[in-house]
């Protein structure tokens, strides 16, 4: 999906009102020095691409993020503020239902959510002049 035509300000508002707090809750008890961000993004569409990938694609050691509250709210925000996003996700959602697993918070998941927080920070405040 090409995130170029999303309403970035509305997505930012959704993130700051609820998603950010859910991420903080998920990370509660984790030391702020524990994880170094290794995933980066250069502009808002790129940030959303990386955010989508880390939030919804199962990875080795962390298969369960898509069921978390922050993930569901992220999906809702993208569905509302990115034209045509919902349609592209129907097949992915059906595939995910087949893979449904018990929710387990692993260290790998904590690391992944720390990466997500970093990506959202760059989405909210891209360093490039083209904001």
């Amino acid at each position: 999906y090409d995130f170029t035509n999303c309403d970035f300000e509305k997505i930012k508002a959704a993130y700051l009102s609820t998603i950010s707090k859910d991420l903080i809750t998920y990370m509660s008890g984790t030391k702020s020095t524990e994880f170094n961000n290794t995933v980066s993004c250069s502009n808002r569409p790129h940030c959303l691409t990386e955010i989508q990938s880390l939030t919804f694609n199962p990875t080795a050691g962390c298969a369960s993020l898509a069921k978390e509250m922050f993930a569901m709210k992220t999906k809702a925000a993208l569905a509302i503020w990115c034209p045509g996003y919902s349609e592209t996700q129907i097949n992915a959602t059906q595939a995910m239902k087949k893979r449904r697993k018990r929710k387990v918070t692993t260290n790998k998941c904590l690391e992944q959510v720390s990466q997500l927080q970093g990506l959202w920070r760059r989405f909210n405040r891209p360093l490039l002049k083209q904001q």
Partner: antibody, heavy 119, light 107 residues
Framework: EVQLVQSGAEVKKPGSSVKVSCKAS????????IEWVRQAPGQGLEWIGV????????NYNENFKGRATLTADKSTSTAYMELSSLRSEDTAVYYC????????????WGQGTTVTVSS | SIVMTQTPLSLSVTPGQPASISCKAS??????VTWYLQKPGQSPQLLIY???NHYTGVPDRFSGSGSGTDFTLKISRVEAEDVGVYYC?????????FGQGTKLEIK
């Protein structure tokens, strides 16, 4: 506990350069932007620029472009702001600050470094 | 650059009374406004981010509102510890810019 500790006061001659350091602790240094802001005596706040310590990306206020250089050393968790071609109007307190967890504000500030430019 | 204009530049308030500071942007900054307080002899400290969100530990007597070009910081009941200079800041466009500051004194 997050802390930003800046280097001590400096007295410089016009035309010279100054390099202010900002040592971060209590968080993953590479993960958060470091901002630089200055405040002339009795004046308001003026943004100088920002650096991403993770990759060295920077963005400068045009008013300081060519004179200010922001760098970061990940091995020591220290950010630096160098200002060249100093003039008397550069006399100010220079602050480093960290972006907050959402990327929309500066949540931790250094104690400030006084730079005096005088002949 | 986006110019942030604060009014008033100073105000004197009796403890327990409300106070209000206005910040106007020269062009729309969406909701990308932050408020800081600089107490005498200290570094600035974060109060409110993204127009109306309280930073951790900030008393709820502080509140922020507005969008687009007009923003307001309100203190419902001023206390002696609230003295200092209040700054609004926009982070919608580079360069980031601050208002001139509003000095709050206690009567």
């Amino acid at each position: 506990e997050v802390q930003l500790v800046q280097s001590g006061a400096e007295v410089k001659k016009p035309g010279s350069s100054v390099k202010v350091s900002c040592k971060a602790s209590g968080y993953a240094f590479s993960n958060y932007l470091i901002e630089w802001v200055r405040q002339a005596p009795g004046q308001g706040l003026e943004w100088i620029g920002v650096i991403d310590p993770g990759n060295g990306d920077t963005n400068y206020n045009e008013n300081f472009k060519g004179r200010a250089t922001l760098t970061a050393d990940k091995s020591t968790s220290t950010a630096y702001m160098e200002l060249s071609s100093l003039r008397s109007e550069d006399t100010a307190v220079y602050y480093c600050a960290r972006e907050d967890n959402t990327g929309t504000a500066f949540d931790y500030w250094g104690q400030g470094t006084t730079v005096t430019v005088s002949s | 650059s986006i110019v942030m204009t604060q009014t008033p530049l100073s105000l004197s308030v009796t403890p327990g009374q409300p106070a209000s500071i206005s910040c106007k942007a020269s062009q729309s900054v969406s909701s990308d406004v932050t408020w800081y307080l600089q107490k005498p002899g200290q570094s600035p400290q974060l109060l409110i981010y993204y127009v109306s969100n309280h930073y951790t530990g900030v008393p709820d007597r502080f509140s922020g509102s507005g969008s687009g070009t007009d923003f307001t910081l309100k203190i419902s009941r001023v206390e002696a510890e609230d003295v200092g200079v209040y700054y609004c800041q926009q982070h919608h466009r580079f360069p980031l810019t601050f208002g001139q500051g509003t000095k709050l004194e206690i009567k």
